[in-house]
């Protein structure tokens, strides 16, 4: 990785399958300093799950969260 991860939390892997939409309460993007772009979905149990922003289901979930 060209960037140090010491200074900002980064995702180094993405969840393989979609989470149930109902389990997600919010999202945020990891820092631009991270080598891998990622969306972090926060579940209702407060787990932070890394997802690939290029995946269709991820974009759909983001749109849904923005609308709600």
């Amino acid at each position: 990785s060209p960037y140090s991860s010491d200074t900002t939390p980064c995702c180094f892997a993405y969840i393989a399958r979609p989470l149930p939409r109902a389990h997600i309460k919010e999202y945020f993007y990891t820092s631009g300093k991270c080598s891998n772009p990622a969306v972090v979905f926060v579940t209702r149990k407060n787990r932070q799950v890394c997802a690939n922003p290029e995946k269709k289901w991820v974009r759909e979930y983001i749109n849904s969260l923005e609308m709600s």
Epitope: S1, S5, D6, P9, C10, C11, F12, A13, Y14, I15, A16, T30, V40, T43, K45, N46, R47, Q48, V49, C50
Partner: nanobody, 124 residues
Framework: EVQLVESGGGLVQAGGSLRLSCAAS????????MGWFRQAPGKEREFVAR????????YYADSMKGRFTISRDNAKNTVYLQMNSLKPEDTAVYYC?????????????????WGQGTQVTVSS
């Protein structure tokens, strides 16, 4: 059965150092982050640092940077926390934990497995 066993805690004077160890067994942890948390009496458990088991990528809580160093030895299935320039406010029970690699691994809720903890006491 997954087991995380911490050791290396104890009583140390302010300004001193300790190295905590966490021996992991019971599964393959290559797809996990290993993290250290601490909990002082009457306070919530707080994140200290985490390391990717296979990647070695690290992340530290802001307040720990510079004094604490997390590392791992894959051959020994052990994760370490080197703590230098210890202060009385570092007194706490220190816990080792494991989080799936697809999480950000910076909050307690990201972690699936926990050790029993090791007490660190820093006297002034």
């Amino acid at each position: 059965e997954v087991q995380l066993v911490e050791s290396g805690g104890g009583l140390v004077q302010a300004g001193g150092s300790l190295r905590l160890s966490c021996a992991a067994s019971g599964r393959t942890f290559s797809s996990y982050y290993m993290g250290w948390f601490r909990q002082a009496p009457g306070k919530e458990r707080e994140f200290v640092a985490r390391i990717g088991w296979s990647s070695g990528s690290t992340y530290y809580a802001d307040s720990m940077k510079g004094r604490f160093t997390i590392s791992r030895d894959n051959a020994k299935n052990t994760v370490y926390l080197q703590m230098n320039s210890l202060k009385p406010e570092d007194t706490a029970v220190y816990y080792c934990a494991a989080a799936p690699r697809y999480t950000l691994a910076t909050v307690t809720y990201d972690y699936d497995y926990w050790g029993q903890g090791t007490q660190v006491t820093v006297s002034s």
